[in-house]
């Protein structure tokens, strides 16, 4: 389980009218459910139940976003429509270039994501918890356009991007 270095870039307009980027760094873990790869895309917050919908149209998302899912306490959803791994798969099927799970409320999800899968996803599935998760969700809950960059090594420079 390697460390995932996540940079969250917020686009803010400055008084001069230009756009400034603010970068926040946090760490998570690459789970065995996905690949240990770099990925980047606009952050799209997804409700766990939102991943239950299986309409054809819902699979026609544009490619290249990073899904952020805050998992709820298991007792709030005793009969989930999909396993955590199933939810990650559904997000990737819809065009997510990576999925980040906040497992703070549901630490059991870590074991589910790390069960050796014969067919792991070809995109990264990262989990965050504790202070890093709080930091991430604080940014995600702002009404701002934000991009996440996930890397499997510490970022060399704060503005580094990589190919999708």
């Amino acid at each position: 389980k390697e460390t995932a270095f996540v940079e969250v870039v917020l686009f803010e307009s400055s008084p001069s009218g230009d756009y400034t980027t603010y970068t926040t760094g946090l760490t998570g873990r690459f789970s065995r459910a996905g690949a240990t790869l770099s990925a980047e895309g606009e952050i799209v917050q997804m409700h766990p139940l939102g991943l239950c919908n299986n309409n054809d149209e819902e699979d026609l998302y544009e490619y290249g976003w990073v899904g952020v899912v805050k998992l709820e306490q298991p007792e709030l959803d005793p009969k989930p429509c999909l396993t955590v791994l199933g939810k990650a798969k559904r997000a990737v099927q819809r065009g997510a270039t990576a999925v980040i799970f906040d497992v703070s409320e549901n630490p059991e999800a870590i074991d589910q994501l790390n069960q050796g899968s014969e067919d792991p996803l070809k995109r990264p599935v990262v989990y965050v918890k504790g202070a890093d998760a709080i930091k991430l969700m604080n940014i995600v809950n702002k009404q701002k356009v934000a991009r996440a960059r996930i890397q499997h090594r510490p970022p060399r420079q704060p503005t580094e991007y990589f190919d999708m």
Partner: antibody, heavy 116, light 107 residues
Amino acid sequence: EVQLVESGGGLVQPGKSLKLSCSASGFTFSSHGMHWIRQAPGKGLDWVAYISNNSGTIYSAAVRGRFTISRDNSKNTLFLQLNSLKSEDTAIYYCARGYNYPGAYWGQGTLVTVSS
Amino acid sequence: DIQVTQSPSSLLASLGERVTITCQTSQSIRNYLNWYQQKPGQVPILLIYYATSLQTDMPSRFSGQYSGRSFTLTITSLEPEDIANYFCLQHYSVPYTFGAGTKLELK
């Protein structure tokens, strides 16, 4: 079937305001980012504004401070408020779905003509 | 803001010919560039995203490549239905910017 239908265009005098709407159907509107793109008659495409699914916004330099993009998820509708209009804002205005970029789904466009 | 220079602005080509359109950016945008096709009187459609990925249902004669800050759209063998305007869009840095377009016409 994904559908985007723009409305609200028309003839308006310089300095006046107009509000464009884009009605969405066939997908979960609240989950998606949305763009406005415009095209002056016989000219190229000009990216105008974007709103994320959590209502974060970004604008092109040409419209920042004059135009406002917004959305009403309960009505599956995207808006573009055009203030202090100039003759150079004359164009067909398209709405398009997409996160990082305008994707496969665009509306047919609504024509805004700014003239005295 | 990132400048996108598209060339040529117009292009005359024969059916079956190989066609290449180029976009050059003022700074590195990695592969954050799309190509759109717009036929006369129609709405633009997404052709290629992230520089090289062909949009579903688009013919395989279209392809995208890039090297550094230079991006190319290639049509391997021109068909009558390919007569259109072509635009590139950088979406690496906000605000996003389109190239000025290329008008592709039959010789």
